[in-house]
């Protein structure tokens, strides 16, 4: 009976529940448009289960299709500010290894102060995701306004 | 041997496929910025599988990491209206128990009439999520324009 | 022995990991507001695992609750263009079978040049999803700016 019940079961590990939700740590120095992320329970509601951070960039540990999502809010911003500083653009992409470098997700702020989006994309073990914010405006570090995450969806 | 192996496996039910998608019922009375939600097949394409509604607010029944998503469209709105009534802000947060109260997701409308976003966050059984819309503008009740949902992702 | 072991696990297929991420192929001829999609590894990072394309529209192959997401960026666009061509609206809906025709997701561009959103919705085998872009503005074909996808979440 117990064995029959076990028939319907699935090894937990093989579900590949890799998931991460990060909060903004800081922006890069001049000429470095990357955002630097941090995560972990000590920091609040951010976490990494599987993926890792490498110098503030997210590195994937398991091959598969992932849902990648991001929200970035500009810190001192009104629709006037946003349009005056246009173009302010956010791009999420694979930045290493260089052979796999590609832009996955791109959004411009235009007259808004927040962008938010998500997409499904294949990622491979070792892929490092970078989030580039071009323009002079500063992103908010509030954890409910700026965040970045990935969720493994299927092999 | 076979039984020991089965131990490491997981009953399908315990995958925790908790999920809900809600449609707007109504806004709160004055001084109550909360949106009140409703769900169920009789209402159209909204549903609750696991989570429950408690006086129009969503209560979580299973611990885990959830993908929370929301879209809110303002009802009588143009970019002029939106900027004139600025700031109109939507915040999604845990509102009870009070000890776990926190803002999870925050967006302002600026010159737009729709906000949409999503994020991963840990939620615990008993957490109630509230969605607060500040400002004088009214949200659309159209089910394709305003909705709020959660999806259990992993333990 | 190997077969007996397999008994205890859940066939990968039965998890219903249906998923698709599509890139824009082209817009429709005049009087046809539909966007026509394409997908497959030869095209880059788009793919179909389960769902199929039928004349550029996405057809569902498995009943269940799906996460539907979309991002559309207008090609030659500034906040001025967007407001001058207002209303430019994107709607995602079930367009066939006719008996199940319904709008699932609707967003207007107002003064922005990108819309992005997602929602959970029940879909049935045979449902075809259409994405209608009304207005005269052209969507970007860049794969990081315009994409449309679905992910099976639960039965």
């Amino acid at each position: 009976q117990r064995f029959a019940q076990a028939q319907q079961q699935l090894p937990l590990e093989s579900l590949g529940w890799d998931v991460a939700e990060l909060q903004l740590n800081h922006t890069g120095p001049q000429q470095d448009p990357r955002l630097y992320w941090q995560g972990g329970p000590a920091l609040g509601r951010s976490f990494l289960h599987g993926p890792e951070l490498d110098k503030g960039q997210l590195r994937i540990h398991r091959d598969g299709i992932y849902m990648v999502h991001i929200q970035v809010t500009l810190a001192i911003c009104s629709s006037t500010t946003a349009s005056r500083h246009h173009p302010t653009t956010l791009a999420v992409g694979i930045c290493s290894p260089a052979s796999r470098s590609i832009s996955l997700l791109r959004l411009s702020f235009h007259q808004g102060c927040t962008i938010a989006s998500q997409r499904l994309t294949p990622l491979a073990r070792g892929d490092t995701l970078c989030t580039n914010l071009t323009g002079t405006l500063l992103p908010s570090r509030n954890t409910d306004e700026t965040f970045f995450g990935v969720q493994w969806v299927r092999p | 041997q076979r039984f020991a192996q089965a131990q490491q496996q997981l009953p399908l039910e315990s995958l925790g496929w908790d999920v809900a998608e809600l449609q707007l019922n109504h806004t709160g009375p004055q001084q109550d910025p909360r949106l009140y939600w409703q769900g169920g097949p009789a209402l159209g394409r909204s549903f609750l599988h696991g989570p429950e509604l408690d006086k129009g607010q969503l209560r979580i029944h299973r611990d885990g990491i959830y993908m929370v998503h929301i879209q809110v469209t303002l009802a009588i709105c143009s970019s002029t209206t939106a900027s004139r009534h600025h700031p109109t802000t939507l915040a999604v947060g845990i509102c009870s128990p009070a000890s776990r109260s926190i803002s999870l997701l925050r967006l302002s409308f600026h010159q737009g009439c729709t906000i949409a976003s999503q994020r991963l966050t840990p939620l615990a059984r008993g957490d109630t999520l509230c969605t607060n819309l500040t400002g004088t503008l009214l949200p659309s009740r159209n089910t394709d324009e305003t909705f709020f949902g959660v999806q259990w992702v992993r333990p | 022995q190997r077969f007996a072991q397999a008994q205890q696990q859940l066939p990968l297929e039965s998890l219903g990991w249906d998923v698709a991420e599509l890139q824009l192929n082209h817009t429709g001829p005049q009087q046809d507001p539909r966007l026509y999609w394409q997908g497959g590894p030869a095209l880059g990072r788009s793919f179909l695992h389960g769902p199929e394309l039928d004349k550029g529209q996405l057809r569902i192959h498995r009943d269940g609750i799906y996460m539907v997401h979309i991002q559309v960026t207008l090609a030659i666009c500034s906040s001025t263009t967007a407001s001058r061509h207002h209303p430019t609206t994107l709607a995602v809906g079930i367009c066939s079978p006719a008996s199940r025709s319904i709008s699932l997701l609707r967003l207007s561009f107002h003064q922005g040049c990108t819309i992005a959103s997602q929602r959970l919705t029940p879909l049935a085998r045979g449902d075809t999803l259409c994405t209608n872009l009304t207005g005269t503005l052209l969507p970007s074909r860049n794969t990081d700016e315009t994409f449309f996808g679905v992910q099976w979440v639960r039965p």
Partner: antibody
Framework: QVQLQESGPGLVKPSQTLSLTCTVS??????????WSWIRQPPGKCLEWIGY???????DYNPSLKSRVTISVDTSKNQFSLKLSSVTAADTAVYYC????????????WGQGTLVTVSS | DIQMTQSPSSLSASVGDRVTISCRAS??????FNWYQQKPGKAPKVLIY???SLQSGVPSRFSGSGSGTEFTLTISSLQPEDFATYYC?????????FGCGTKVEIK
């Protein structure tokens, strides 16, 4: 108002490498809203797109020239450059640098063009 | 690559004439299509983008239409400053390609 200006030698010997630089003023390459292209036009002939570069350094080249072309960017100088190796007389053309939107390939700003002659 | 074939390669017309220039794409490109004008010794200049949208500052006598593979540029009443070479270009996929031009000369 964005302006583009090509510079480089007007005469290159066959089998050598053609090198041109485009200096951008009135817009910052690093702002990230545009692709920066090279386009050429042999005397009395068609326009041919050579390739583009983005501020990040990512490139795309015309397959017909890909094996010989390198486009690079120097964001600190607000410049991008073209190198075309192993040139022949068929590479004699007016070379233009141009800007196109990221979201749509419309060449809305051009340099005035520079004639490069390949001859010994 | 997508080939763009322009016709005619040249035409003679008088001031006030209605002029049409055609361009055919070797495959369907939807509305991802543009027209440019080039005068001798100058760089090309955008006239029409996205098949039928008039670039800012371009006179309304210029108009564009198309069907996904066949495109037409129309000058409703030719003016002296319109004598030039006109190029079509596809923005559907890289490599971006141009037609070989139509030279509009004075009759």
């Amino acid at each position: 108002q964005v302006q583009l200006q090509e510079s480089g030698p007007g005469l290159v010997k066959p089998s050598q490498t053609l090198s041109l630089t485009c200096t951008v003023s009135g817009d910052s390459i690093i702002s990230g809203g545009y692709y920066w292209s090279w386009i050429r036009q042999p005397p009395g002939k068609c326009l041919e797109w050579i390739g583009y570069i983005f501020y990040s350094g990512s490139t795309d080249y015309n397959p017909s020239l890909k094996s010989r072309v390198t486009i690079s960017v120097d964001t600190s100088k607000n410049q991008f450059s073209l190198k075309l190796s192993s040139v022949t007389a068929a590479d004699t053309a007016v070379y233009y640098c141009a800007r196109s939107g990221y979201s749509y390939a419309l060449f809305d700003a051009w340099g005035q063009g520079t004639l490069v002659t390949v001859s010994s | 690559d997508i080939q763009m074939t322009q016709s005619p390669s040249s035409l003679s017309a008088s001031v006030g004439d209605r002029v049409t220039i055609s361009c055919r794409a070797s495959q369907f490109i939807g509305r991802y299509f543009n027209w440019y004008q080039q005068k001798p010794g100058k760089a090309p200049k955008v006239l029409i983008y996205a098949e039928s949208s008039l670039q800012s500052g371009v006179p309304s006598r210029f108009s564009g239409s198309g069907s996904g593979t066949e495109f037409t540029l129309t000058i409703s009443s030719l003016q002296p400053e319109d004598f030039a070479t006109y190029y079509c270009q596809q923005s559907y996929s890289t490599p971006w390609t141009f037609g070989c031009g139509t030279k509009v000369e004075i009759k």
